[in-house]
């Protein structure tokens, strides 16, 4: 007998999602228009390519990276796409309302789509901690709250701390990680007897997760350089990110082997550790003056990632109910913090090098920014978790966690598909 979507969700989801989509269309109709200025077409194409890289990262990279569960791979990929599509629409409007609205209309440019895709990426990072335990109706709520929280965080940081697009978007790693972990903490944790096999990884889904990791690995330099305002800063960011992720791959594979008693390589470690360098270098990728520093960062990040993957899952599974293979949350939280610390160190070196007496104040500002990002992530994450626990969403029963058949129509109804 095939498992069906609960009746109430079948009524609730289409109504909720389509009403929301209709509302978004109306908001776009009344409040937005395209940038009408004529521009050099070559520049337009180049600008679009950066946005395309970000979309590939989000849809294919993060979509497949989270698809390693034996019985939840379809849902991981498709739900990611659903959240990305919804998140980008809401993020474009929100960013426009927060930054442009005094002029009466939100002007949509390729840059605003780029920003929106990066905001939506935040949700895709966070959701790794809860995928398999929530339905689409709940994910819609999560998208709306997280994109709103991140948009407001960026606006506050921009206004209070005077930071640019790149700097306030690079808090995304820490923000997304802590948001996801705090939502996971609120959701029902125990996996009932008989469902343990569902949160295990299988060979084919693990291969698709590796494919996701490869796409992220290839396009991470685009992500870290997308919001920088000059060619020289972008060039630096691309080079440094590339060196960092290259070293973190070598470190991840060799470190994973080192961490295993028989010297075997863990798929789960490798999936996430290959990206470690890109996350750690993100905040300061345009500032790092030479390749060796980016490479050292990639090495340290890879080791932290493998170490975290070895020792943290037990704790996360007990406390937060996060399965062993969903290690993006705590991985990004550690590596995001490392990246922020590196930025603060570089800031201090710059201040010392300039003979500037403002070191303490500059460090305090940076710590203030980071603390604000973590606090808003935790608070909005807890709020989202509480909202997701409301009965109206008809959350999947714990026995139906990590099960594609709850959500998808499979003609052959095979359990192992």
């Amino acid at each position: 007998m095939s498992s069906k979507y609960p009746r109430s969700v079948r009524r609730c989801l289409p109504l909720w999602a389509l009403t929301l989509e209709a509302a978004l269309i109306l908001l776009f109709y009344f409040f937005t228009h395209y940038d009408a200025s004529l521009e050099d077409q070559k520049g337009l194409v180049a600008s679009y390519q950066v946005g395309q890289d970000l979309t590939v990262m989000a849809a294919i990279g993060l979509g497949f990276l989270t698809s390693s569960f034996r019985r939840h791979s379809w849902s991981s990929v498709a739900f990611n796409l659903f959240m990305l599509a919804l998140g980008v629409q809401w993020a474009i409007l929100l960013d426009g309302f927060l930054s442009q609205f005094p002029s009466g209309k939100v002007v949509i440019t390729l840059f605003s789509i780029r920003l929106a895709t990066m905001s939506a990426l935040s949700v895709l990072i966070s959701v790794d901690a809860v995928l398999g335990k929530v339905n689409l109706a709940q994910l819609v709520v999560m998208v709306l709250v997280e994109v709103t929280a991140l948009g407001n965080l960026r606006m506050v940081i921009s206004n209070i701390f005077n930071t640019d697009y790149h700097m306030n978007m690079m808090h995304i790693y820490v923000f997304a990680a802590y948001f996801g972990l705090s939502v996971a903490w609120c959701l029902p944790k125990p996996l009932p007897e008989g469902t343990e096999d569902k949160d295990q990884t299988a060979t084919i889904p693990s291969l698709s997760a590796m494919l996701g990791a490869l796409f992220l690995w290839m396009f991470w330099p685009s992500f870290n350089s997308a919001l920088l305002r000059s060619p020289i800063e972008r060039k630096n960011a691309v080079f440094n990110t590339y060196y960092a992720v290259a070293v973190s791959v070598v470190t991840a594979i060799s470190g994973s082997s080192l961490a295993h008693p028989q010297g075997k390589i863990s798929k789960t470690y490798v999936h996430s550790a290959v990206l470690a360098g890109g996350v750690a270098v993100g905040t300061s990728c345009h500032l790092i003056p030479s390749p060796w520093l980016a490479m050292v960062l990639g090495l340290v990040a890879g080791l932290i990632s493998v170490g975290g993957a070895k020792y943290l899952p037990g704790c996360c599974n007990r406390v937060l109910g996060i399965p062993h293979s969903s290690i993006m949350g705590y991985n990004f939280s550690l590596l995001g913090l490392l990246g922020e610390i590196i930025y603060i160190v570089l800031l201090v070196l710059d201040t010392v090098g300039a003979g500037n007496g403002m070191i303490g104040f500059q460090v305090l500002l940076s710590i203030g920014e980071l603390s604000l990002a973590i606090v808003i992530a935790l608070m909005s994450g807890l709020l989202t978790g509480l909202l997701l626990n409301l009965k109206i969403w008809k959350a999947p029963h714990e026995a139906k966690y990590f099960d594609d058949q709850v959500f998808w129509k499979f003609p052959h109804l095979a359990v192992g598909f």
């Epitope: 390729l110 005077n162 305002r229 500032l287 710059d350 500059q362």
Partner: antibody, heavy 126, light 106 residues
């Protein structure tokens, strides 16, 4: 090679009407630099108006001109534009285009407006 | 960040040492530039990143400061230095300018 920013398009215009300023660049790789418009009302200080990134991907405006002015560039023609709509008396000023250069400090990047156009006067009057 | 220059004008003689101050409403790190504008001309960059002298600018101009408090010093005023001086922050958009300091002949 001498870096030049040659401005044109200023003049007298009635309130509510439109005007388009141009700034033709030569002597440097135009597509590698962010470009700005800065204005100066008669007898007053300098006021930043707008910026466009090197690849045209992003534009930012001063609150006083948001929704009325549009900055754009054509990298194939080495030209920067400022389309000014719904002009008001308070928009009367000399408008300058300026090149933004990014230079590395000890570690952080620093920005400077190292080359300026000669300026073009826009008078909004009925 | 808003910038406030002082004094708004000053009178000095050739050979004098002149100091102009610029205060920011919030920390702008080292993102501060100084420009000189002669009557009827476009502004010209003198000093960038607080203390770096722009190529072609005379060495009698120097900048200093940190965080929120900055100064431009002209060690020995020359006849061609009688002009208006503006500070500008390039820390974040909008890239605001100070209101200007006019240096006049005594």
């Amino acid at each position: 090679e001498v870096q030049l920013l040659e401005q044109s398009g200023g003049g007298v215009v009635q309130p509510g009407r439109s005007l388009r300023l141009s700034c033709a660049a030569s002597g440097f790789t135009f597509s590698s630099y962010g470009m700005h418009w800065v204005r100066q009302a008669p007898g007053k200080g300098l006021e930043w108006v707008a910026v466009i990134w090197f690849d045209g991907s992003n534009k930012e405006y001063a609150d006083s001109v948001k929704g009325r002015f549009t900055i754009s560039r054509d990298n194939s023609k080495n030209t920067l534009y400022l389309q000014m709509n719904s002009l008001r008396a308070e928009d009367t000023a000399v408008y300058y285009c300026a090149r933004e250069e990014v230079v590395r400090g000890v570690i952080l990047w620093s920005r400077k407006f190292d080359y300026w156009g000669q300026g073009t006067l826009v008078t909004v009057s009925s | 960040a808003e910038l406030t220059q002082s004094p708004s004008s000053l009178s000095a003689s050739v050979g004098d040492r002149v100091t102009i101050t610029c205060r920011a409403s919030q920390t702008i790190g080292r993102y501060l530039n100084w420009y000189q504008q002669r009557p009827g001309k476009a502004p010209k960059l003198l000093v960038y990143a607080v203390s770096s002298l722009q190529s072609g600018a005379p060495s009698r101009f120097s900048g200093s400061g940190s965080g929120t408090h900055f100064t431009l010093t002209i060690t020995s005023l020359q006849p061609e230095d009688f002009a208006t001086y503006f500070c500008q922050q390039s820390y974040s958009s909008p890239f605001t300018f100070g209101q200007g300091t006019k240096v006049e002949i005594k």
